[in-house]
């Protein structure tokens, strides 16, 4: 209460208004001035926030009323000002004064869980007393006002697994829980104010308590026996089936590893990390005929087990897996991965080479048929016996690589092949011969015993030991006694003069027959002609000038030949233009006897067998139109080239450099002459006939010299060869 010192002034109380009053208005209190004598001349005024809206004053009496429901939780204090005015004068009777209206609390707010939804995770099998979560409710009422905001927590749902501390809201585990039985629990918590006394308000919340997994379950196979099948044809690494163990745990705790307790040589088990299945893998190929089923024992263990949980994983779960091997119709199997046979060259037709053997690995043991892929030299019978069908020449082919196939009689799809290597063994069937062509020169004034040539020999036969050649002169040349031979016994010999003085006019050339014998059994001897030119030497006795002159002569001759070829080409061109001109007029057929396009089949015979297949037709007319002729070589040059190529062919085949040169020449022809034939394929003629019994069909192999070649016989072949006869006839005339 307040009163002025001079006993005059305001009189009031500090006012309290209960919140949430349901009446239209609530009397707060009365402002009163003790100067008010009740004469109805004082007017009371209320000022400040809430005056006239929340609080109204009866201006006659000073009674203050709250006309709105108040909420302490919204506003707990109002500070207002009061005035008292004498209405007769309109002046304030007393100074304006401030007073307080406090809103007193009632228990009108229930406890609220502001942090909901609550969710907690706790490991399964946690011991009693383990803290799960703390829940907290908030009561908006005045904590200082009695028990309005004093809370007690209790569990409405969740016993007997959980308990709550009444004053703190701490939830604890009260009994062990197994996630595999139930993995989550809804716990309902009630918070009551007024410390639970009558008239208390309450609020509830739900707590979702999830049990996290611990590895308290081992994986267990659902089946005692799994039946799987595998084809005997399955390659290693094949997945042949799946086995499955079940683990009631989840996540990492359910990860498992499978293993095989026995026979881990043939099978393996890997874990599919996605599905946790065990995939049985074939580690080694199986053979139905060898073993048609397997019984293996598999076990499964968890991958991650903590030390304190080992008690749950004492014994690993095991199961049996029966793997049935499925029989497959397998191709025949040769007894050996390859065969190596030897046979003497020149063995007659039908000679035994060797025998191969294949069997059907299947139970039914089908009979086997054998065949040789593309061979005209060997054949094989149903027993696997290989024989020759043609004589063999080691010098043509020292080795044969055959592919022999074995086919099941009742299922020709089942086929196997084996490589067979036939080595042709040497017999001494080739006499030694000069290793090169020798042109020797001797001065007219040469003295006796002068070395004029060192000679060496080659033998196409294979030598088990080193070849040894014996050199001698023929009986006639020995009698002649102009020259003698000395065997150096190192497979070379020297030719020496056996007299003094020679005459260029009387006898310009000597032809010496040199006999060369090998050390084979039986020994073979060849006669080789050595040409010795008599030379008009200089004072120093040098044959060089003689050799140079010969070289110039030969060059001169070559120039003549080239000129002759050029003239021939010009004649041919003239002839072609004449024909084209005639064609323009009357369009005659090329061959009046038969009007169709004429093509020649050029056969290649240096390949063993398959000659019938190498038939490619070439348009002769197109071939004739070549305007650039290759440089003609003399007999000896060409022969030497062919010999060198022939030697190479015995080793690896035609030298690629030779063909590169040939192709480049052809490209040059094509670039120079737009009328050159299309260069679509390459036919190799350098080796023509070398593999056949008949020998070479080429005129290059002829013993006749270039100058002696006569092509008149072409005229006798009829109209088809008329142009060819004309071409070669003209060329020969030009040369002559």
């Amino acid at each position: 209460d307040y009163k002025d010192d001079d006993d005059k002034g305001w009189v009031w109380n500090q006012f309290f208004v209960p919140e949430e009053m349901n009446t239209t208005s609530h009397h707060v209190g009365r402002l009163r001035s003790d100067l008010d004598n009740g004469n109805n001349s004082f007017q009371y005024k209320l000022l400040g926030a809430g005056a006239g809206s929340t609080f109204i004053i009866d201006e006659r009496t000073g009674d203050i009323y709250a006309i709105e429901k108040l909420d302490r939780e919204e506003r707990s204090l109002y500070i207002l000002r009061a005035q008292v005015i004498d209405i007769t004068t309109g002046r304030a009777v007393e100074p304006e004064s401030e007073f307080v209206i406090k809103v007193s609390d009632i228990n009108d707010n229930e406890p609220k869980f502001l942090d909901e939804p609550y969710e907690a995770i706790v490991p399964e099998m946690s011991p009693e007393g383990t803290l799960v979560i703390q829940v907290t409710a908030t009561d908006a009422d005045d904590p200082a006002s009695g028990n309005n905001a004093r809370l007690l927590y209790s569990l409405l749902q969740g016993q007997p697994y959980f308990s709550i501390e009444p004053t703190t809201g701490v939830i604890r585990i009260s009994s062990k829980m197994d996630r595999e039985l139930q993995d989550e629990y809804w716990v309902i918590i009630q918070a009551k104010d007024m410390i639970g006394l009558p008239g208390a308000l309450s609020g509830t919340t739900s707590v979702l308590i999830k049990l996290s997994d611990v590895n308290d379950n081992k994986p267990i196979f659902k089946e005692r026996l799994y039946r799987l099948t595998v084809s005997e044809s399955a390659p290693t690494g094949t997945s042949i089936g799946r086995i499955m163990a079940y683990d009631n745990d989840i996540g990492e705790n359910a990860e498992m590893d499978y293993s095989i307790e026995d026979d881990s040589q043939t099978f393996d088990i890997i874990t599919n990390n996605e599905t946790q299945e065990g995939i049985v893998i074939l580690k080694k190929k199986v053979d139905f005929e060898h073993q048609n089923h397997y019984l293996i024992r598999a076990n499964v263990k968890n991958r991650h087990v903590a030390e304190h949980l080992m008690e749950y994983h004492v014994e690993a779960s095991t199961t049996f897996v029966r793997v049935q091997v499925e029989d497959e119709d397998e191709p025949p199997v040769f007894l050996l991965p390859y065969y190596l046979f030897e046979i003497l060259e020149e063995s007659p037709h039908g000679s035994f080479v060797g025998m191969v053997s294949a069997t059907d690995p299947d139970q039914r043991k089908s009979p086997i048929r054998y065949s040789i892929t593309r061979s005209k030299v060997f054949s094989i019978d149903d027993n696997g016996t290989i024989i020759t069908t043609n004589p063999l020449d080691r010098e043509i082919s020292a080795w044969y690589n055959l592919s022999i196939t074995a086919t099941e009689k009742y299922n020709v799809q089942q086929i196997s092949a084996v490589p067979v290597y036939v080595q042709v063994l040497n017999i001494n069937d080739h006499a030694p011969e000069f290793s090169e062509y020798y042109d020797s020169y001797v001065c007219e004034n040469a003295g006796s015993g002068q070395v004029i040539q060192t000679i060496s020999a080659v033998d196409r036969d294979e030598s088990v030991e080193d070849h040894h050649f014996y050199f001698n002169l023929s009986v006639e040349d020995t009698k002649n006694s102009s020259f003698i031979i000395i065997d150096n016994e190192d497979n070379t010999a020297v030719i020496l003069t056996n007299r003094t003085g020679f005459s260029l006019q009387e006898e310009p050339v000597f032809y010496i027959s040199v006999l060369i014998a090998d050390n084979g059994i039986p020994s073979l001897t060849s006669t080789n002609t050595l040409t010795i030119h008599i030379c008009d030497c200089d004072d120093y006795g040098s044959t060089q000038t003689c050799r140079d002159k010969d070289l110039l002569l030969s060059m001169g001759f070559r120039t003549e030949v080239i000129l002759a070829i050029l003239i021939s080409i010009m004649i041919i061109f003239g002839f072609i233009f004449l024909i084209l001109g005639l064609k323009q007029r009357r369009k005659p057929t090329l061959f009046p006897e038969k009007g169709e396009d004429f093509r020649e089949n050029i056969f290649r015979y240096d390949d063993e067998g398959g000659g019938e297949e190498d038939t490619e037709a070439f348009d002769i007319v197109q071939l004739r139109s070549s305007t650039i002729m290759r440089e003609r070589k003399t007999r000896k040059t060409a022969a030497a080239e062919i010999r060198s190529l022939y030697r190479q062919s015995l080793q690896v085949g035609p030298d690629s450099a030779i063909f590169r040169k040939f192709i480049l020449e052809k490209l040059e022809e094509a670039n120079t002459d737009p009328c050159a034939p299309p260069f679509d394929s390459l036919q190799t003629y350098a080796f023509e006939g070398t593999g056949s019994l008949a020998g070479s069909l080429s005129s290059l192999g002829s013993a006749v010299s270039d100058q002696d070649e006569n092509y008149d016989y072409l005229n006798e072949l009829g109209p088809r060869f008329k142009r060819l006869a004309c071409m070669f006839g003209s060329a020969m005339q030009s040369n002559n």
Partner: antibody, heavy 122, light 108 residues
Framework: QVQLQESGPGLVKPSETLSLTCTVS????????WSWIRQPPGKGLEWIGY???????NYNPSLKSRVTISVDTSKNQFSLKLSSVTAADTALYYC????????????????WGQGTMVTVSS | DIVLTQSPGTLSLSPGERATLSCRAS???????LAWYQQKPGQAPRLLIS???SRATGIPDRFSGSGSGTDFTLTISRLEPEDFAVYYC?????????FGQGTRLEMK
């Protein structure tokens, strides 16, 4: 224009409580002072008390112990309760309005109801 | 309480005449808070004058009030037939509000 209409039982037994209601129509009950006045048969007028719309009241000291005046702003009504009535309380009861709007002092009654006769008799 | 005494108790006059009604207070009425009412039989009182001299809305100007302190007068300058009724004075200067016992104005 504002009109007042009294209602209530015309007969009340002695010692019982007389209850009357005055309904304000044509205007709001807010911001005015509302009084009850009675007139015994053949006699003069007697002021019973007033109520302000906020609920503030002032009663005639001669009746204060037995009188309660209340207001229901939602219905635009105010009421009179007179307890422990006797035959002396038989009268014509009027409701009336102070003429001054939110006056700080009292004023004459500018609007009256037609009055309702209440007889106290057993 | 302030006691109001009205005189005469009954006044008999003819229409057209002047009527003067008196009201005396047992103590001074603060602020001249005195009102005059007219009541006809079977009707509620009707406010004529407030604040001792202020005519209420719709009241003919033949009605006038005067006085202060303790003595107050209501004058009807020229009586009309409808003016014959009972007239009450009321003070509202001090609680409780009190009324006079009334003056009956009757036609002679």
């Amino acid at each position: 224009q504002v009109q007042l209409q009294e209602s209530g039982p015309g007969l009340v037994k002695p010692s019982e409580t007389l209850s009357l209601t005055c309904t304000v129509s044509g205007g709001s009950i807010n911001s005015y002072y509302w009084s009850w006045i009675r007139q015994p048969p053949g006699k003069g007028l007697e002021w019973i008390g007033y109520i302000y719309y906020i609920g503030s009241t002032n009663y005639n000291p001669s009746l204060k112990s037995r009188v309660t005046i209340s207001v229901d702003t939602s219905k635009n009504q105010f009421s009179l309760k007179l307890s422990s009535v006797t035959a002396a309380d038989t009268a014509l009861y009027y409701c009336a309005r102070d003429s001054r709007y939110r006056s700080g002092w009292y004023d004459a009654f500018d609007i009256w109801g037609q009055g309702t006769m209440v007889t106290v008799s057993s | 309480d302030i006691v109001l005494t009205q005189s005469p108790g009954t006044l008999s006059l003819s229409p057209g005449e002047r009527a003067t009604l008196s009201c005396r207070a047992s103590q001074s009425v603060a602020g001249s808070y005195l009102a005059w009412y007219q009541q006809k039989p079977g009707q509620a009182p009707r406010l004529l004058i407030s604040g001792a001299s202020s005519r209420a809305t719709g009241i003919p100007d033949r009605f006038s009030g005067s006085g202060s302190g303790t003595d107050f007068t209501l004058t009807i300058s020229r009586l009309e037939p409808e003016d014959f009724a009972v007239y009450y004075c009321q003070q509202y200067g001090k609680s409780p509000i009190t009324f006079g016992q009334g003056t009956r104005l009757e036609m002679k």
